[in-house]
């Protein structure tokens, strides 16, 4: 039920996860873990941010985007077959269990032996920050408890986080938007 994100051995892998802070400095803690999301927190943490900065990271895992603007997409450098599996992006919204959590499946393929170099995929096109949905209906709407300090407006993530599975199929390999009222 997870959308698959693919990379070849030796390449960098990209796992998209976004939210929109109320203000650039008003950040929400985020953790990335190897393995599907636990009930509480993140297990097997590979990277963590707090309200100000990245406060924990491990070799080969980094945030390439501007996390201060809510781009907490994970880049895994120089992947191997062992990097395959499910990863959890958990956006730790204040309040008891208000967290948004997303399971992303990474599939690593053996490197192709090709006679000529091929152009790498344009991830900017493949994973747009915002996505206006059409056809089957809106992205999933989730109502959270009052968030006086954060007032998040939207969290963006992968297509399988949509309630409408038909829409998810249409948006496979695209980012998707979840709006929080």
């Amino acid at each position: 039920s997870e959308v698959e994100y693919r990379a070849e051995v030796g390449q960098n892998a990209y796992l998209p996860c976004f939210y929109t802070p109320a203000a650039p400095g008003n950040l929400v803690p985020v953790c990335w873990g190897k393995g599907a999301c636990p009930v509480f927190e993140c297990g097997n943490v590979v990277l963590r941010t707090d309200e100000r900065d990245v406060n924990y990271w491990t070799s080969r895992y980094w945030l390439n985007g501007d996390f201060r603007k809510g781009d907490v997409s994970l880049t895994i450098e120089n992947v191997t077959l062992a990097d395959s599996g499910i990863y959890c992006c958990r956006i730790q919204i204040p309040g008891i269990m208000n967290d948004e959590k997303f399971n992303l499946k990474l599939v690593i393929k053996p490197a192709k032996v090709t006679p000529a170099p091929t152009r790498q995929r344009d991830f900017t096109a493949a994973f747009p920050r915002m996505l206006t949905t059409r056809g089957h209906g809106p992205a999933e709407t989730q109502t959270l408890g009052s968030l006086p300090d954060i007032n998040l407006t939207q969290i963006s993530t992968l297509a399988n986080e949509l309630r409408d599975s038909r829409l998810a199929n249409d948006l496979r390999d695209s980012g998707a938007t979840i709006r929080i009222g």
Partner: antibody
């Protein structure tokens, strides 16, 4: 191999107190949140309480809030549940549970708590 | 709170039967759902996590499917050791809640 061993259950009178312990092995205890889940006789499973890996965050079911306190000692790989003001409806088998990838992945065998006069 | 409702509290089946247990959520929970097998006097055993991922060491006759509000646990060919009570657990938000359980009994 992950192992969770509960202890401390027993018979207690209504209004009394009991402290459950759970000793963990086979994984990096401090890296994972832990929970207590219970099953009353003839009933289903009910989540009771949880604590984050560092011990800084705690969570409780409404039915036990204000009466039960969860804690952990990462240096001893041990999880605790202090149960006060016990009621007959707290009678159950209490399971210690590891919160791993995808949810509650490993469970102990359980310890029976009986609240009766 | 989100309520989890399992299709039936008990069902009777024979060895070799294909058994399907359904769990419905009162609101969408994406894929934050697990399935557990529980036998009297034993620790519950996780079969499926993230709605469809098979727990390591669990026989392949068990499978999970679904997303959003409706989830299914399927036992493709029921074995004698599979007679037990099965629970779904959702954990997308606080508090994590179990379904009421489905007891699979010998017909």
């Amino acid at each position: 191999q992950v192992q969770l061993v509960e202890s401390g259950g027993g018979l207690v009178q209504p209004g009394g107190s009991l402290r459950l312990s759970c000793t963990a092995s086979g994984f990096t205890f401090s890296s994972y949140a832990m929970s207590w889940v219970r099953q009353a006789p003839g009933k289903g499973l009910e989540w009771v309480s949880a604590i984050g890996g560092s011990g800084g965050s705690t969570y409780y079911a409404d039915s036990v809030k204000g009466r039960f306190t969860i804690s952990r000692d990462n240096s001893k790989n041990t999880l605790y549940l202090q149960m006060n003001s016990l009621r007959a409806e707290d009678t159950a088998v209490y399971y210690c549970v590891k919160d791993g990838a995808g949810g509650f992945d490993y469970w102990g065998q359980g310890t029976l708590v009986t609240v009766s006069s | 709170d989100i309520v989890m409702t399992q299709s039936s509290s008990s069902l009777s089946a024979s060895v070799g039967d294909r058994v399907t247990i359904t769990c419905r959520a009162s609101q969408g929970i994406i894929n934050h759902l697990g399935w557990y097998q529980h036998k009297p006097g034993k620790a519950p055993n996780r079969l499926i996590y993230a709605a469809s991922s098979l727990q390591s060491g669990v026989p392949s006759r068990f499978s999970g499917s679904g997303s959003g509000t409706e989830f299914t646990l399927t036992i493709s060919s029921l074995q004698p050791e599979d007679f037990a009570t099965y629970y779904c657990l959702r954990h997308n938000s606080y508090p994590p809640t179990f379904g009421q359980g489905t007891k699979v009994e010998i017909k």
